[in-house]
């Protein structure tokens, strides 16, 4: 079937970076400036994304791939293809509609984005707190009191951080 279609449809021979030009007897023509086609057999080329203003160009558009944008420092990308820029905060803060606010006691954020997350509850694992938590860092759980016999010195690292729940994706 594919072979039959190829014989019937000369456009299928047009590679990425070109389009099948109906105005020129379906000749494969290169994409015009500021446009691209990322797959073969296209009848049109897509307009390149323009990274304007606070959206900076991370990767230039080529004949076969769209431009990629990122955000000016102080903000970070959100959404598919960096469709939005969202404000950075300091570690120990989270972003609210009122701007960056410090994490409440008992919570932390070790990144410039995302939400404040509760400190690990060491006692749930029968452990004790070896290092207290801060706004920027989780607690470090140590051995349980029963483990504190001579020669026992294992330290449990904090639980892996969950993904920040601040992205629309």
């Amino acid at each position: 079937f594919e072979r039959t279609r190829s014989l019937q449809d000369p456009c299928s021979n047009c590679p990425a970076g070109t389009f099948c030009d109906n105005n020129r007897n379906q000749i494969c023509s290169p994409c015009p400036p500021n446009s691209f086609s990322s797959a073969g057999g296209q009848r049109t080329c897509d307009i390149c994304r323009q990274c304007k203003g606070v959206f900076r160009t991370r990767k230039e558009c080529s004949s076969t791939s769209n431009a990629e944008c990122d955000c000016t420092p102080g903000f970070h990308c959100l959404g598919a293809g960096c469709s939005m820029c969202e404000q950075d905060c300091k570690q120990g803060q989270e972003l609210t509609k009122k701007g960056c606010k410090d994490c409440c006691f008992g919570t932390f954020n070790d990144q410039k984005r995302g939400i404040c997350r509760p400190w690990t509850n060491c006692s749930l694992d029968g452990k004790s707190v070896l290092v207290n938590g801060t706004k920027e860092r989780d607690v470090v759980c140590g051995p349980s009191p029963a483990d504190l016999s001579p020669g026992a010195s294992s330290v449990t690292p904090p639980a892996p951080a969950r993904e920040p729940g601040h992205s629309p994706q």
Epitope: G79, S83, C85, E86, T96, K97, H166, S167, P168
Partner: nanobody, 123 residues
Framework: EVQLVESGGGLVQPGGSLRLSCAAS????????MNWVRQAPGKGLEWVAN????????YYVDSVKGRFTISRDNAKNSLYLQMNSLRAEDTAVYYC????????????????WGLGTTVTVSS
């Protein structure tokens, strides 16, 4: 085409005032949170203020509280920033930016930005 165009920037002396405007087109202005964001020379972006859809909620970065006032006129598809008691540190390019679809619930991303208007505070 979805577009934001800022105006009203200029040179002003310390202690002076300016009113920035942002004209919105190509979308239902009254359905979106709107923001002002600035970039001082050689610095990163800094969020300045935001306002909800009907103007009943307004928030400001600490450094401009009591000096700047954000407002909007949905009938005119316009956003404003009244800046009083201007200081040298307010010198920046000021951008108008639209809050994304889920702004305030799942994120605080801004998806449409103007190209900015320059405010210079100098004697």
């Amino acid at each position: 085409e979805v577009q934001l165009v800022e105006s009203g920037g200029g040179l002003v002396q310390p202690g002076g005032s300016l009113r920035l405007s942002c004209a919105a087109s190509g979308f239902t202005f009254s359905s979106y949170w709107m923001n002002w964001v600035r970039q001082a020379p050689g610095k990163g972006l800094e969020w300045v203020a935001n306002i909800n859809q009907d103007g009943s909620e307004k928030y400001y970065v600490d450094s401009v509280k009591g000096r700047f006032t954000i407002s909007r006129d949905n009938a005119k598809n316009s956003l404003y920033l009244q800046m009083n008691s201007l200081r040298a540190e307010d010198t920046a390019v000021y951008y108008c930016a639209r809050g994304g679809e889920e702004y305030g619930s799942s994120h605080y991303g801004m998806d449409v930005w103007g190209l900015g208007t320059t405010v210079t505070v100098s004697s």
